[in-house]
Each structure stands twice: as structure tokens, then as C-alpha cells.
């Protein structure tokens, strides 16, 4: 039975040209995290394997920095970066947990962060 929950940064906004940290946290389970995938719609951004470290997709390698922790830092933001991002936690023995973050990249200098929320 999967008992864990993923806490994410929820809906966030950031300025064009700036950077943002995408962060998820898995709680309420003793399952071992073997890998975390960061994906945007149909695209793979990065993978963090607990043993082998980071794999960064070439299309993002100049704009993505691993971390902090299992999170991902997205840099040099453009309005095209607006959209849904998913953290996919591969765990043993529970299986897969998925968290969702919606990022809005704003032209203006007003970029407010949304509240944190949980996905069971």
C-alpha cells in the first residue's frame, strides 16, 4: 500500500531571465527513493539516480543545474518555460509517486510564489 505524499512548491511564478528552484519532497513513507525524474509534459529534463547521480537532457543542459538535493534549478527562464513540471519519485517497494508544479514565467517584475500544497 502506498502511504506516501509528495509536497511540492505548487503554483509558482518567476521573472523572465531569472531562475527558479523546482522542489518536491516525499514524506509519510519509509520507501527507499531509487530515482527522481523531472519532466515537463512530454520532455525529460533530468534524472537523479540515488546511486549514479544526475543525467541532464542535452536540450536543457545549458539551462538546468542539479539540486539543491533532489530538486532542479531552471535558469535563464523564458515565457516558453511556462507550464506543468512533474517530479516522479521511483521508490522501493512502494512504486511511483508524482508531484506537479505549475510555473508561470512573467514578463513583468512582479513574480509571486504560490502556496505549498500536497498531492496524495
Amino acid at each position: 500500500m502506498m502511504t506516501g505524499t509528495i509536497e511540492t512548491t505548487g503554483n509558482i511564478s518567476a521573472e523572465k531571465g531569472g531562475s527558479i528552484i523546482l522542489q518536491c519532497h516525499l514524506s509519510s513513507t519509509t520507501a527507499q527513493v531509487t530515482q527522481v525524474n523531472w519532466e515537463q509534459q512530454d520532455q525529460l529534463l533530468a534524472i537523479c539516480n540515488a546511486d549514479l547521480g544526475w543525467h541532464i537532457s542535452p536540450s536543457f543542459k545549458d539551462r538546468v543545474a542539479p539540486g539543491p538535493g533532489l530538486g532542479l534549478t531552471l535558469q535563464s527562464l523564458t515565457v516558453n518555460d511556462t507550464g506543468e513540471y512533474f517530479c516522479i519519485y521511483h521508490t522501493y517497494p512502494d512504486g511511483t509517486y508524482t508531484g506537479r508544479i505549475f510555473l508561470e514565467v512573467l514578463e513583468s517584475s512582479v513574480a509571486e510564489h504560490g502556496a505549498r500544497f500536497q498531492i496524495p
Epitope: 531509487t34 539516480n49 549514479l52
Partner: antibody, heavy 119, light 107 residues
Framework: EVQLVQSGAEVKKPGASVKISCKVS????????MHWVRQAPGKGLEWIGG????????SYNQKFKGRATLTVDTSTSTAYMELSSLRSEDTAVYYC????????????WGQGTLVTVSS | DIQLTQSPSSLSASVGDRVTITCKAS??????VAWYQQKPGKAPKLLIY???YRNTGVPSRFSGSGSGTDFTLTISSLQPEDFATYYC?????????FGQGTKLEIK
């Protein structure tokens, strides 16, 4: 120039162990993952596992867990793969292969080491 | 484990031909697929990584495409040195797995 040089061919009896070395040069050893892959005669490629030398993180293919042991000696920039309890179906060419920078695919390969298991 | 199925298993073609090899994954692997070329008695050589990126030094006649579960390696105009066995590999999740290989032979 990046080079991965493996130890020579081995002939072993069933039940024995074999330890293959892979000495690298031309890059900073600790910055890249090392994978081990094998290929039985006339067959395809099979991933044994990978090791990250900087922190000792190791990922094994469950098929080999308990029989394969991956280690490194950072002082000599050498990776090792030991396989125990050998059986005839372990007869294969064993390759070490460097994981590309911040990627999991393998961009440089050793020349291969033939291990023959026969009574 | 993620299974990769290549087709065809073997293929006869002539110099100058356009050749396509496909690789189908048993589940979505996004673009985490590499292609290798192997000649008899030699180690594999990385051709394509992340589905569509040519490795350094690989001729432009080699191209890769695909995402999700379906991937393709295309050789636009076969050269004599291209006759070899080709393998796809997924690195979306461990254990990393390979297709069974496609042997490209001279017609």
C-alpha cells in the same frame, strides 16, 4: 586522449570467481560514472551495473546482485568488476564503459575482456 | 525491467541505400535512448544519445528520432563501413537495458 584499458582474457572453472580491471587515462576518473556491460558469444549486450567513483554509489542489475561486485581504486584510476560463482553461461566478453558527462549513456568503451568458464 | 524490441533483427542493404532501424520500448522512456554501433570483435561505439543527438565525430548520415516508446535510427546513405550490428539502449530507469540488436549486412 580518453582510454580504457582492460585486463587480459581469463579461463575459469565453474564456481570460481574472476576479477577484471579497467585502467583509465585521459580524463578525471572521479568525475564520470563507470558502467560494466557483458556480451555472450553471438548475443546482445547486457548491463551489469554502474559505479560513481566520487561517492562510491553503485547500481546493480538485480540479475547480478550478490554475484557481481564493482569497486574502484581512485589512486590508480582503475575500476574493477568481480563476478563470483561462475557458471558456463557467464562465458562472455566483459566491457567497462565510461558514462558521458552528466549522462547515463556510455561514450568511451574498453576493448573488452573475454572470460571463458569451462570445466 | 523495461524491454526494448528492435526491428528488423537483420537487414540486407546496398551502399547508398537509406536504412531505418526501429526500437520499441515496453513503457514510456521519454527521450532516454541511445544507439550504438558494433563491429565484429570490437567494442560498441556510441552514435546517438538522448534519442536524437549525434555523438562527437559521428557522420551526419546517422540520425535518431523518437520519444516515448518508439525510436528510429536512420542512415541516410549507407557507406561500406556502416555494415555492423546496431543496438538501442534505454537509460530512463535501471537496470539499463538494450535491444536485441539489428545486424546490417551487405546485399
Amino acid at each position: 586522449e580518453v582510454q580504457l584499458v582492460q585486463s587480459g582474457a581469463e579461463v575459469k572453472k565453474p564456481g570460481a570467481s574472476v576479477k577484471i580491471s579497467c585502467k583509465v587515462s585521459g580524463y578525471t576518473f572521479t568525475e564520470f560514472t563507470m558502467h560494466w556491460v557483458r556480451q555472450a558469444p553471438g548475443k546482445g549486450l547486457e548491463w551489469i551495473g554502474g559505479l560513481k567513483p566520487d561517492n562510491g554509489g553503485i547500481s546493480y542489475n538485480q540479475k547480478f546482485k550478490g554475484r557481481a561486485t564493482l569497486t574502484v581504486d581512485t589512486s590508480t584510476s582503475t575500476a574493477y568488476m568481480e563476478l563470483s560463482s561462475l557458471r558456463s553461461e557467464d562465458t562472455a566478453v566483459y566491457y567497462c564503459a565510461r558514462g558521458a558527462y552528466y549522462r547515463y549513456d556510455a561514450d568511451y568503451w574498453g576493448q573488452g575482456t573475454l572470460v571463458t568458464v569451462s570445466s | 525491467d523495461i524491454q526494448l524490441t528492435q526491428s528488423p533483427s537483420s537487414l540486407s542493404a546496398s551502399v547508398g541505400d537509406r536504412v531505418t532501424i526501429t526500437c520499441k520500448a515496453s513503457q514510456d522512456v521519454k527521450t532516454a535512448v541511445a544507439w550504438y554501433q558494433q563491429k565484429p570483435g570490437k567494442a560498441p561505439k556510441l552514435l546517438i544519445y538522448s534519442a536524437s543527438y549525434r555523438n562527437t565525430g559521428v557522420p551526419s548520415r546517422f540520425s535518431g528520432s523518437g520519444s516515448g516508446t518508439d525510436f528510429t535510427l536512420t542512415i541516410s546513405s549507407l557507406q561500406p563501413e556502416d555494415f555492423a550490428t546496431y543496438y538501442c539502449q534505454q537509460h530512463y530507469s535501471t537496470p539499463f537495458t538494450f535491444g536485441q540488436g539489428t545486424k546490417l549486412e551487405i546485399k
